[in-house]
């Protein structure tokens, strides 16, 4: 199962900087359209990887003013790339009662990355506690 | 593998017109942003024109020293990059390089194409 | 316009020694802890290749007799040990606004 826990780890590594991106972006708030955007929160289990993708879908957008507007573009660039894929993300792509992204309350942009990074180290958490359980599930 | 090609260059005369093209293949293209970089003995490496991606709704931003002389444009349909360069002076001279900003620099080039502008 | 004045513009070190480049930058371009400097290579009718980026990471498929440092305005790039495909001029270049502006170069000849 070599290549197996290789695409974990690249999974674990992918997830941790999109935190730190999430992170990065939350020093430019005040330079991102305070635009109100679908912001999953308290997630229902197996529906991680849908919530994700809201994430990612939404329309997150610089300003356009001042000098940070070629960091914070790069940074939202970044955060939209795919992760490599996982067992658990594989299934939940195929999981068809998960909430639409529309349906997600909408925040403005220090809440939608607040909530992202939540998002984040829960999956973190999950792909953690499935491994020292010795699933491949997530 | 990441190819780009670029295409177009040649002698013109000062105040003349000249497009460059550039493919690009191995990658997804739509998602780029694509630079165009030229250098010089002159003026050594110098960053040109940049245009985004359809994600970005495609914004296009130039040095100050070709703005409102020169224009980037890409077809996403084709992957391919354009530089229409109009009033062209001996100072544009030099190589052309198509590059693509991944990230965090300029990770994937063109070999170049020469322009000359010389009457 | 953020300027990168790089030194020396040419040196001459021996096969397995250390040769050390600057770059500084005309004001900070580092913000929150990520300095958005990068570093190039290019040997005579080649384009330039990108080595490190950020400041520090080294680039895929780079040897890492390659290393960068610095931050805000004064940045690094060492090669240790120099070896003989190494010879070529050695460029820093910042992303941190627009435009984008390359340092002049820096020729490595070795002894």
């Known amino acids: 199962h070599k290549s197996s826990s290789q695409g974990q780890d690249r999974h674990m590594i992918r997830m941790r900087q999109l935190i730190d991106i999430v992170d990065q972006l939350k020093n430019y708030v005040n330079d991102l359209v305070p635009e109100f955007l679908p912001a999953p929160e308290d997630v229902e289990t197996n529906c991680e990887w849908s919530a994700f993708s809201c994430f990612q879908k939404a329309q997150l957008k610089s300003a356009n003013t001042g000098n940070n507007e070629r960091i914070i573009n790069v940074s939202i660039k970044k955060l939209k790339r795919k992760p490599p894929s996982t067992n658990a993300g594989r299934r939940q792509k195929h999981r068809l009662t998960c909430p639409s992204c529309d349906s997600y309350e909408k925040k403005p942009p220090k809440e939608f990355l607040e909530r992202f990074k939540s998002l984040l180290q829960k999956m973190i958490h999950q792909h953690l506690s499935s491994r020292t359980h010795g699933s491949e599930d997530s | 593998e990441v190819e780009l090609v670029e295409s177009g260059g040649g002698l013109v005369q000062p105040g003349g017109s000249m497009k460059l093209s550039c493919a690009a293949s191995?990658?997804?293209?739509?998602?780029?942003?694509m630079d165009w970089v030229r250098q010089s003995p002159e003026k050594g490496l110098e960053w040109v024109a940049e245009?985004?991606?359809?994600?970005?709704?495609?914004?296009?931003y130039y040095a100050e020293s070709v703005k409102g002389r020169f224009t980037i444009s890409r077809d996403d349909s084709k992957s391919s990059v354009y530089l229409q360069m109009n009033s062209l002076r001996a100072e544009d001279s030099g190589i052309y390089y198509c590059?693509?900003?991944?990230?965090?620099?300029?990770?994937?080039w063109g070999q170049g194409t020469l322009v000359t502008v010389s009457a | 316009d953020i300027v990168l004045t790089q030194s020396p513009a040419s040196l001459a070190v021996s096969l397995g020694q250390r040769a050390t480049i600057s770059c500084r930058a005309s004001?900070?371009?580092?913000?929150?802890?990520?300095?958005?400097m990068h570093w190039y290579q290019q040997k005579p009718g080649q384009p330039p290749k990108l080595l490190i980026y950020l400041a520090s990471n080294l680039e895929s498929g780079v040897p890492a007799r390659f290393s960068g440092s610095g931050s805000g305005t004064d940045f690094t790039l060492n090669i240790h040990p120099v070896e003989e495909e190494d010879a070529a001029t050695y460029y820093c270049?910042?992303?941190?606004?627009?435009?984008?502006?390359f340092g002049a170069g820096t020729k490595l000849e070795l002894k």
């Open positions: 245009i985004r991606s359809e994600a970005d709704n495609h914004p296009t």
């Open positions: 270049q910042h992303s941190r606004e627009l435009p984008l502006t």
């Open positions: 590059t693509e900003y991944d990230y965090e620099g300029f990770v994937h």
């Open positions: 004001k900070s371009v580092s913000t929150y802890g990520y300095s958005y």
């Open positions: 191995g990658f997804t293209f739509s998602d780029a942003w």
